[in-house]
């Protein structure tokens, strides 16, 4: 799978994680920090 950094317009898309652009899938993906989940890493879990 080809990946690259998200475009600058997606700054802030991932609330608690790193934004990755999955080129072949035509979508952005949030790689969440430890303790966070959700499509945009918006949920905290213990």
């Amino acid at each position: 799978v080809s990946i690259t950094k998200c475009n600058s317009d997606m700054n802030g898309y991932c609330l608690h994680g790193q934004c990755i652009y999955l080129v072949d899938m035509s979508q952005n993906y949030c790689r969440c920090e430890v303790g966070y989940t959700g499509v945009r890493c918006e949920h905290f879990y213990l």
Epitope: T4, S8, D9, M10, Q27, N28
Partner: antibody, heavy 116, light 106 residues
Framework: QDQLVQSGAEVKKPGASVKVSCKAS????????IQWVRQAPGQGLEWMGR????????KYREKFEGRVTITADTSTNTAYMELSSLRSEDTAVYYC?????????WGQGTLVTVSS | DIQMTQSPSSLSASVGDRVTITCKAS??????IAWYQQKPGQAPRLLIQ???TLQPGVPSRFSGSGSGTDYTFTISSLQPEDIATYYC????????FGGGTKVEIK
């Protein structure tokens, strides 16, 4: 199946406002950004602005600042675009477009006609 | 706002011809460019995103290339069904469409 269903055609007088809705089904708008694009008859595509429904943040094209308001109601999974002080040049098809989790998934378009 | 200068605004070519459309950005857009096809009365159809990634179901005669500020869209062998208007879109910083290229058959 993911869908963006827009409200029906509108006819407005110059100086009036119009509010176009864009209801999402099959996905949560909080996971996406919703863009708005318009196309006047026989003209090209023009980006107007976008909203991040999760945070409520908006970005607008400079030429529309102060005249366009994009909002989202996450409880109904619906985005809105309101354009005020309408003039004849605002006659166009207005599209909502999902981006973020999927690159550019378009609504069917809403024709807004501005005529006295 | 980033400006996108698309050329030519229209072109006429024969079936089987190679067709090339260019878009020049006013600043580096880091390969974040997409190409759309629009036929009369229809919503735009995404053909290519991230400069060269073809969308599923899009014929391989369509391709894209470029980097920095200069980008190219190519139809390697023009077919009658390719008659449409084509638009580039930069999506690096906000969004800007090119002015469009109307492709006709000679």
């Amino acid at each position: 199946q993911d869908q963006l269903v827009q409200s029906g055609a509108e006819v407005k007088k110059p100086g009036a406002s119009v509010k176009v809705s864009c209801k999402a089904s099959g996905f949560n708008i909080k996971d996406t950004y919703i863009q708005w694009v318009r196309q006047a008859p026989g003209q090209g595509l023009e980006w107007m602005g976008r909203i991040d429904p999760l945070r409520g943040n908006t970005k607008y094209r400079e030429k529309f600042e102060g005249r366009v308001t994009i909002t989202a109601d996450t409880s109904t999974n619906t985005a809105y675009m309101e354009l005020s002080s309408l003039r004849s040049e605002d006659t166009a098809v207005y599209y909502c477009v999902r981006s973020g989790t999927l690159f550019d998934f378009w609504g069917q378009g809403t024709l807004v006609t501005v005529s006295s | 706002d980033i400006q996108m200068t698309q050329s030519p605004s229209s072109l006429s070519a024969s079936v089987g011809d190679r067709v090339t459309i260019t878009c020049k950005a006013s600043q580096d857009i880091h390969k974040y460019i997409a190409w759309y096809q629009q036929k009369p009365g229809q919503a735009p159809r995404l053909l290519i995103q991230y400069t060269s990634t073809l969308q599923p179901g899009v014929p391989s005669r369509f391709s894209g290339s470029g980097s920095g500020t200069d980008y190219t869209f190519t139809i390697s062998s023009l077919q009658p069904e390719d008659i449409a208007t084509y638009y580039c879109l930069q999506y690096d910083n906000r969004r800007t469409f090119g002015g469009g290229t109307k492709v006709e058959i000679k």
